[in-house]
């Protein structure tokens, strides 16, 4: 009979969900790398597809500074980024599938700490929820690594050398080569967070030029060779 069918249907009714957030206790990553901070949630609003805002903050729940915020229009999986601190944070999860997982690029030691995810339903079902315990991000130091070394043409038929290294703490760079005292001529500039670049502005002699990167965790070096052939300036690296 009809009531029997209806009872059978009701037996398959979705269990009433309540607000909850699932985050791991800790995420570990090395400086210079990227990390994913997982965060999934359940909510009591069945299949909500109204406007929503996803927020991540650091330090403490509810009051800590926001590092990321995005908003999705009704029915949309596209969460438009409104805030991404230093442009290094982006939503990896699908908020419509209750996933607020966040990717953090170019990690620095200073990024270590607790992060808290929050979701806000801003439509008819006006409601919000934030993780209380958060996920602890541990960024570990990284030994130096030289990522690029090159010789480039400079002014007045001269040549200059560039060396870019990464590490955390940021490594100190030094050039050495065939010209006496040329290491003191290296111009060192801070790059993006964990990357640094040093320039040797004028390569006056042929030979081997070595870039050394060092921090408290170790050192790395790489070399480039300059040979100017008779008849026309040129390099061999």
């Amino acid at each position: 009979d009809a009531s029997g069918d209806l009872l059978n249907t009701e037996a398959h009714s979705a269990p009433a969900q309540r607000w909850s957030m699932q985050v791991p206790a800790e995420v570990n990553a090395e400086a210079g790398d990227a990390a994913v901070l997982p965060c999934t949630f359940t909510h009591p609003h069945r299949h909500y597809d109204g406007p929503l805002t996803a927020i991540w903050r650091s330090g403490e729940p509810y009051a800590g500074p926001q590092v990321f915020r995005c908003t999705a229009a009704p029915g949309s999986e596209l969460c438009q980024t409104a805030l991404s601190l230093h442009g290094r944070f982006r939503l990896l999860g699908n908020p419509r599938r209750n996933d607020l997982s966040l990717r953090v690029e170019r990690l620095a030691l200073a990024d270590s700490g607790r992060y808290f995810c929050r979701v806000e339903f801003t439509g008819d079902a006006h409601d919000r929820y934030e993780s209380r315990h958060g996920v602890r991000l541990r960024v570990t130091a990284a030994a130096p690594r030289i990522v690029n070394i090159s010789v480039l043409p400079g002014p007045a038929h001269a040549f200059r050398a560039l060396c870019t290294a990464e590490g955390e703490p940021p490594p100190a760079l030094a050039w050495s080569g065939p010209a006496p005292g040329n290491s003191s001529a290296a111009l060192q500039g801070q790059g993006h967070g964990y990357q640094v670049t040093a320039e040797l502005p004028a390569l006056t002699r042929d030979g081997r030029y070595t870039c050394t990167a060092a921090n408290s965790l170790g050192r790395a070096e790489a070399s480039v060779y300059l040979f100017r052939f008779h008849g026309a300036p040129g390099t061999s690296t």
């Epitope: 398959h12 299949h47 596209l78």
Partner: antibody, heavy 120, light 106 residues
Framework: EVQLQQSGAELVRPGASVKLSCTAS????????MHWVKERPEQGLEWIGR????????EYDPKFQGKATMTADTSSNTAYLQFSSLTSEDTAVYYC?????????????WGQGTLVTVSA | QIILTQSPAIMSASPGEKVTMTCSAS?????MHWYQQKPGTSPKRWIF???KLASGVPGRFIGSGSGTSYSLTISTMEAEDAATYYC?????????FGGGTKLEIK
Amino acid sequence: EVQLQQSGAELVRPGASVKLSCTASGFNIKDYYMHWVKERPEQGLEWIGRIDPEDGDIEYDPKFQGKATMTADTSSNTAYLQFSSLTSEDTAVYYCVTDYDYDGGWFAYWGQGTLVTVSA
Amino acid sequence: QIILTQSPAIMSASPGEKVTMTCSASSSTSFMHWYQQKPGTSPKRWIFDTSKLASGVPGRFIGSGSGTSYSLTISTMEAEDAATYYCHQRSAYPWTFGGGTKLEIK
């Protein structure tokens, strides 16, 4: 087991209306959106719209606004799609689809489809 | 509305061959979803959230892409993969499908 059982094929005259049904078993339709999708051989798949059977909230593709009417009856666990002022362009297979079990992807379960043929 | 353009419309591949089909969106999307349909049957969800395989989908299927450009790749074609594949977006109402890529076996 989750299933969507759609009503049988329809042969209708131009200008007439048709009402298709989709009865769900294995879950309660009020807990999930029900969608309707149109399939024509050369046009592929088109999303018509979705209904929230619990409160009747509806979202249509503007292309089908005024042409399609979605309703649902939670007591019989059935969703309906009514098409009006039929033309040859409405000749297609119509699927009802649910987002049940959306953790594993949208449009989890599809009905077997109902073929609607509009012909004089 | 976001228009999804799939290419090629029809393609054929030999068993063991690598197959790639693309889906281009007229506006940026966060994710792309893919469905497989064989003649006379209802579509099946195949790949969701751009790269996640639906339950039962073989690991030779790979979804990738971002923004406006997405692709579905089959690392080694098998006879059972012959079907029509549709991409689908939910980044803006109205939700839309691509026109489909029909993959045939040589």
